[in-house]
Every structure is written in C-alpha cells, then in structure tokens.
Interface confidence: low
C-alpha cells in the first residue's frame, strides 16, 4: 500500500475478548439499482452498548472505505471517483456498472464486543430491465 489509511479495532469475523455479543446488524438486504445510477448501502447496529470504533465497507475481499472513530472517513484510492461517505455510517455508490453486482459487507468493529458483520447483495440492472421493475431475489 503506497498510502496511509486508518487502522481499525478488529479483524473480521465475530467475537472478541470473551464478551457476550448481544448486538445485531440490520441491513438494506438484497437491493437492485439501475446501471449508471446511485445506491446507498446502509447498516445499523442495535441491541448493544458497545462502542463502535470503526466501520469497514468491503466488496468481496476489496476494502472500499473506512469510517474510523479517531480519524474519520477514508475511501480507498481505486474507488475515490465512485464512492461517497454517508449518509451516517453508510456508503453511497455512484455511476454503477454491471460489474458492481455482488456482495457488500459492513463490518462494525466494537469494543468490547468484537466484530459484527452485515451483508448486502446488490444487483445492478440494465436500464431497460430496471424500468420494468425487475428485482433481484435469492431463491
């Protein structure tokens, strides 16, 4: 990495420090959007008093963005043109292409609970398909 990005207090997966993990992640679930458009990826951590130290947004194994309690937002350089922070701890994807179809993960790093992960599946549809109201569904 030729650039500096913030650290985060977690490593992925779940659990940490032997504490009881009571929290749950609510996500926007499976969503579809039109090619060329924008979409907001949103997660919400509830049912825990743990401190959120960082939220990571990942697409498969690629780091998209980090929102760090110490240092604020960092967008990975390869996504700077098409990813905007927010609203809140969410992430806005712009200028969508069909290649953006896939799984996205919000990874909440908390103290003392550990790591909570939410999953969103995004399908980017060709304009004509989206206009006819097609929706992605997991069978």
């Amino acid at each position: 990495y030729p650039y500096d990005v913030p650290d985060y207090a977690g490593g992925g997966g779940s659990g940490g420090g032997g504490s009881m993990m009571t929290g749950t992640i609510e996500t926007t679930g499976n969503i579809s959007a039109e090619k060329g458009g924008s979409i907001i990826l949103q997660c919400h951590l509830s049912s825990t008093t743990a401190q959120v130290t960082q939220v990571n947004w990942e697409q498969q194994d690629q780091l998209l963005a980090i929102c760090n309690a110490d240092l604020g937002w960092h967008i990975s350089p390869s996504f700077k043109d098409r990813v905007a922070p927010g609203p809140g701890l969410g992430l806005t994807l712009q200028s969508l292409t069909v290649n953006d179809t896939g799984e996205y993960f919000c990874i909440y790093h908390t103290a003392p609970d550990g790591t909570y992960t939410g999953r969103i599946f995004l399908e980017v549809l060709e304009s004509s398909v989206a206009e006819h109201g097609a929706r992605f569904q997991i069978p």
């Epitope: 650290d7 490593g11 940490g16």
Partner: antibody
C-alpha cells in the same frame, strides 16, 4: 524506509517497573495502530497490547492487564509500554510492531529490546 | 481465547523440497490468519495475511490457504534462506494469539 527502534529494556527486580519506548520513522505514524509483542527466551511469540491510531481503542493480554499500560505520542512518533509490578515470567524480548493498514497482522517489527526480571 | 495449534513443531527438509506447515484454530477465525518467518536473533517478518494474501516483497514460493479452523503455509521449493521458524497468528479477534511455531531445519 519504515523503521521501528525499541529502547528502555534492562535488568529489573521483581515488583519493579520499566518503561519501553519505540521510535517510529519512515511512515505516517499517526495513521497506524501499533502492537507490543514479546518472546521469552527460547519460546514463541505472545501478543501483549494494542493501541489504535488515535488511542481510542486499547487492548491488553490478560497476563499483563492491570500491570502494563500502552500509550503513544503521535507528535513524537513514539509508542510506549509502561510495565509495573514486573514478574520473572515477564522476562522476554519485547517487540513493537506496526499493524497492517487493513488487518491486525503486523507488517513491520522493531529489532526488540530485552527485559530481564530477576533478583 | 482462541488457541492456535501448529504442526509439526519441527521438520527437516532439503533445498528444493516442498514444505507444508499447518495451523489449526480452536474455533472459526474466518480467513483471518497471518504467517510470520523468524530467524534466530531477528524480528519476525510478515509473509501472509488474511489467510492467503502475500505480503509485498515476499517471494511467490510462499503461499497460504484455508479458512475457518484449518490453514496451511506452503513453501513450493525450499531455498537456503527459508530455514527458520514459522508462526501463525489469528487476527480475527482480541486477544490476538500465535501458534507455537514450526522450526524448519536443514536435513
């Protein structure tokens, strides 16, 4: 070039105190989480403590909790480990290590400083 | 705490051999495992993180695989400079824990 240089080790009696320092250079220190890891003579590696870039997240191994304090001074590019109530089993080489940008793996390590606790 | 068990604890091999070291976690750590190489009197060196991602500057003869609880470090063709001790470390959760090490010696 990333460099981490530990200092402050030495011989101390049981119950005594030591303060280890780690001087960082060659990277933007204030953007990286940092670890202390130790290695007893002839033994394996043991993680000791972690501090996030802005010090908002601090974690300790159970074996040192309540006795050791990790801290950092980003203005001085320095990491510290204050060790109190030292025991014979704390005898080890102590390494400071930089956390990778994206995971808790440790991508750069110092050369280590030896701490010997003995009467 | 997650216990990391490495095997074997030591092995003897010759230059050019294919060497495999395994690491088992006491519970699932997803893909979050790192491998380090340490030579006598030196600091550890990161080889692989996140299970299979090669750290920059590490030769491609090193590779990592596995997820969940079982992981493998493979050296495809052992070189003279590879004789060392290798450690695995889970970076899934606090407290971060290391395996006991595997010493690779010259046969």
């Amino acid at each position: 070039e990333v460099q981490l240089v530990e200092s402050g080790g030495g011989l101390v009696q049981p119950g005594g105190s030591l303060r280890l320092s780690c001087a960082a250079s060659g990277f933007t220190f204030s953007n990286f989480g940092m670890h202390w890891v130790r290695q007893a003579p002839g033994k394996g590696l043991e993680w000791v403590a972690f501090i996030s870039s802005g010090s908002s997240s601090i974690y300790y191994a159970d074996t040192v909790k309540g006795r050791f304090t990790i801290s950092r001074d980003n203005a001085k590019n320095s990491l510290y480990l204050q060790m109190n109530s030292l025991r014979a089993e704390d005898t080890a080489v102590y390494y400071c290590a930089r956390m990778r940008l994206d995971y808790y793996a440790m991508d750069y390590w110092g050369q280590g400083t030896m701490v010997t606790v003995s009467s | 705490d997650i216990q990391m068990t490495q095997s074997p604890s030591s092995l003897s091999a010759s230059v050019g051999d294919r060497v495999t070291i395994t690491c088992r976690a006491s519970k699932s750590i997803s893909k979050y495992l790192a491998w380090y190489q340490q030579k006598p009197g030196k600091a550890p060196k990161l080889l692989i993180y996140s299970g299979s991602t090669l750290q920059s500057g590490v030769p491609s003869r090193f590779s990592g695989s596995g997820s969940g609880t079982d992981f493998t470090l493979t050296i495809s063709s052992l070189q003279p400079e590879d004789f060392a001790t290798y450690y695995c470390q889970q970076h899934n959760e606090y407290p971060w824990t290391f395996g006991g090490g595997t010493k690779v010696e010259i046969k």
